[in-house]
């Protein structure tokens, strides 16, 4: 750490003195102090000498010596007071600029430490400080206004009591700037605009900032529009508003509109698109397939997207059958607005019952007319199976009926022993029926198929099983021949109640 000679923290001299401050370090040293006249600086090896042969009040200040080569960055300082009875203050700067909530140092340095007890800070022309001004004083540095506020941007003077009278410093202008977090905040309304040719339209571009110094403009397809600006100040923010009013829109008014605001921190812009149309429109669409298949007992949400201008005058969901004349409950219909011209309508169908399969139509109306979008809902069912023994054309035949959706596939199994269900170890024979006969196949209903297995002789210690399966599940029926007659066993787990 460098050493200053004389080795005292502060020195008080009278004007006219020759003052010599010597700084000695291990390597080269540098002086740093307030900008003041008449100092001469010369180096002598590892020492640096700061000298003035005619000290004035302006030489009052803290002189710091540093050793640039010192990795610890050590420094030494000495404070010089040049005690001038006519000049109790040395003002180092007449303008101080800080941001809000920073400490503002008003650098009026006392030239005589004895005067410290009688110092005060005032506004120019002897006006008192604003209420809640929290400040402190250091004879080495001056007055510090703590956590300065924008409203404290004033002209100040430092006052010292000398021989019973107050002696003022020259004035110091404090500029407290609002902390500008970034470019001005922007709003452009509406975010999207549609008008029929000949209608009126309004586009409002507004920008706000804590600081008044910012610009805002509205441009149409890269052409800046000349619009009168309205200015306001509320909620501690400056606001500038540009309003574009169009009495009768035409196609040339359509296009991209950008609201642009800029300040020292940068630029913000936001855009919207204005469509001009010949007439009203109403478009319905869905991201879903209009043909829906859902397993019975499960739920389904039907969604319709509506694009319309002007707005909808009416809309509803309708069940078109075929099972009943029931209509969807209004509480299950939900509407959400994505933006001004686009809406989503949802119909919730929880725990679907067989009678709820069929056509669902969404209808909407605006001045452009009616539009409808229809969904077809088919329910999926796991197969139901039944087997009977009969004679067809004199031949003994096992007849298996399977009902479900989608259409079930049928497989016959013959296995040893009497069992409710054949397992792999017992299977003697397997027949697949690739083309069972379709007995009924109506829209929104189950498909019923029939499969025949001709059996010359029923083996009494064996079981015949008809299995049906589809994408939803499977069903089976076991047929056990007994001497007294055939005996059939539906599987224990088959509990479906149509």
């Amino acid at each position: 750490i460098p050493v200053i000679e004389p080795s005292v923290p502060e020195l008080v001299v009278k004007p006219g003195a020759t003052v010599t401050l010597r700084c000695v370090g291990n390597g080269s040293v540098e002086w740093d102090g307030p900008p003041s006249p008449h100092w001469t600086l010369y180096s002598d090896g590892s020492s640096s000498i700061l000298s003035t042969n005619n000290a004035t009040f302006q030489n009052t200040g803290t002189y710091r010596c540093t050793e640039p080569g010192d990795p610890l960055g050590g420094s030494a300082a000495i404070h010089l007071y040049v005690k001038d009875p006519a000049r109790p203050w040395n003002v180092l700067a007449q303008e101080v600029v800080v941001f809000e909530d920073q400490d503002a140092l008003l650098p009026c340095l006392l030239t005589d430490p004895v005067l410290e007890a009688g110092v005060s800070l005032v506004r120019v022309r002897g006006r008192p400080l604003m209420r809640h001004t929290n400040y402190s004083f250091s004879p080495w540095h001056g007055f510090t206004i703590h956590r300065a506020k924008f409203i404290q941007s004033q002209d100040y003077q430092c006052s010292a009591l000398m021989g019973g009278r107050k002696v003022m410093s020259i004035s110091i202008r404090l500029k407290v700037q609002k902390v500008i977090p970034g470019p001005p905040a922007l709003t452009l309304v509406p975010a999207e605009l549609v008008r029929i040719r000949g209608e009126a339209a309004q586009i409002v571009c507004s920008a706000s900032s804590v600081d008044v110094n910012f610009d805002v403009f509205l441009q149409h397809n890269n052409t800046k529009l000349a619009i009168p600006q309205q200015s306001d100040f509320h909620n501690n923010r400056y606001q500038k508003v540009l309003t574009l009013n169009l009495d009768q829109v035409d196609f040339q008014h359509a296009g991209n509109y950008s609201c642009v605001a800029s300040n020292v921190q940068g630029k913000h812009s936001t855009s919207m698109f204005f469509r001009v149309v010949e007439s009203a429109y109403l478009n319905l669409s869905s991201e879903q397939n209009l043909i829906q298949e859902v397993t019975v007992g499960e739920g389904l949400n039907l969604k319709v997207m509506v694009e319309a201008y002007p707005g909808l005058q009416g809309f509803n969901w309708t069940y078109l059958g075929p099972f009943s004349d029931h209509q969807p409950e209004p509480k299950l219909a939900n509407a959400t607005t994505k933006d001004t011209y686009r809406h989503t309508f949802t119909l919730s169908l929880p725990r679907l019952k067989p009678s709820e399969a069929g056509r669902y139509s969404f209808l909407a109306r605006n001045p452009g007319g009616w539009r409808a979008l229809t969904f077809e809902l088919t329910l999926r069912y796991p197969p139901e199976v039944s087997v009977i023994w009969t004679f067809i054309n004199g031949s003994g035949t096992l007849l298996c009926a399977a009902s479900g959706y989608p259409q079930p596939n049928v497989t016959w199994l013959q296995c040893s022993g009497h069992t409710d269900r054949c397992d792999e170890a017992q299977v003697l024979q397997v027949w697949d029926d690739p083309y069972p006969e379709v007995l009924s196949q109506e829209p929104f209903h189950k498909v019923t198929v029939q499969s025949l297995l001709t059996v010359e002789t029923l083996e009494h210690n064996q079981t015949y099983e008809c299995r049906a399966h589809n994408s939803v599940g499977s069903g089976s029926w076991a047929f056990i021949p007994i001497s007294a007659g055939a005996h059939t066993h539906p599987p224990d787990e088959f509990l479906f109640t149509p």
Partner: antibody, heavy 126, light 110 residues
Framework: EVQLVESGGGLVQPGGSLRLSCAAS????????MNWVRQAPGKGLEWVSY????????YYADSVKGRFTISRDNAKNSLYLQMNSLRDEDTAVYYC???????????????????WGQGTMVTVSS | QSVLTQPPSASGTPGQRVTISCSGS????????VYWYQQLPGTAPKLLIY???QRPSGVPDRFSGSKSGTSASLAISGLRSEDEADYYC???????????FGGGTKLTVL
């Protein structure tokens, strides 16, 4: 015994130079500020210059500023006054005087002169 | 013409009280300390009073100093023949940035 002894006085022509010395003894010279005071024949006292203990602070009377230089060598317990561009009005007895060590004053400046030398005569004449 | 004004002479009889005045201005006496020196004939000056009214050790309490506004005075009570000397006041002058002496007062003990 505390003592200050001046030397180096003499006759010199106007425009000439002279170097006065003051040898200090009997006290710790390096801790005291020192002064030169002169007295023209039959006249009153006139303060000439002041130097602080470390030589950091120096004052001169307006009448000698730019012509006289005060200095000291604490290792040699000596005070000096280099006088250049001498004028007739510089003719006087030159005293070196020690500043009073502890006073109520906080400013580094000439204070009370508590010890004086016997003086050395400087005559400037053609 | 000295910056500090002293009467050129003063006199008194032994045992008397004598006062020597020193008049200045706000830039010297008015705002700085006053010092008084005694110079016996043929000798170097001697410090009598410092900081307006303080006596160094060895100076008899017959000598006292005071200051009021821009004037100072040295009072010598119980005057003695050995007090016959020249007396000088001194003060720093802020306008001149230097130490100034009065012209001196020659005190005669009758």
């Amino acid at each position: 015994e505390v003592q200050l002894v001046e030397s180096g006085g003499g006759l010199v022509q106007p425009g000439g130079s002279l170097r006065l010395s003051c040898a200090a003894s009997g006290f710790t010279f390096s801790t005291y500020s020192m002064n030169w005071v002169r007295q023209a024949p039959g006249k009153g006292l006139e303060w000439v210059s002041y130097i602080s203990s470390s030589s950091a602070i120096i004052y001169y009377a307006d009448s000698v500023k730019g012509r006289f230089t005060i200095s000291r060598d604490n290792a040699k317990n000596s005070l000096y006054l280099q006088m250049n561009s001498l004028r007739d009005e510089d003719t006087a007895v030159y005293y070196c005087a020690r500043d009073l060590p502890i006073t109520m004053i906080v400013v580094v400046m000439p204070d009370a002169f508590d010890i004086w030398g016997q003086g050395t005569m400087v005559t400037v004449s053609s | 013409q000295s910056v500090l004004t002293q009467p050129p002479s003063a006199s008194g009889t032994p045992g008397q009280r004598v006062t020597i005045s020193c008049s200045g201005s706000s830039s010297n006496i008015g705002s700085n300390y006053v010092y008084w020196y005694q110079q016996l004939p043929g000798t170097a000056p001697k410090l009598l009073i410092y900081s307006n009214n303080q006596r160094p050790s060895g100076v008899p309490d017959r000598f006292s100093g005071s200051k009021s506004g821009t004037s100072a005075s040295l009072a010598i009570s119980g005057l003695r023949s050995e007090d016959e000397a020249d007396y000088y006041c001194a003060a720093w002058d802020d306008s001149l940035s230097g130490l100034v002496f009065g012209g001196g007062t020659k005190l005669t003990v009758l």
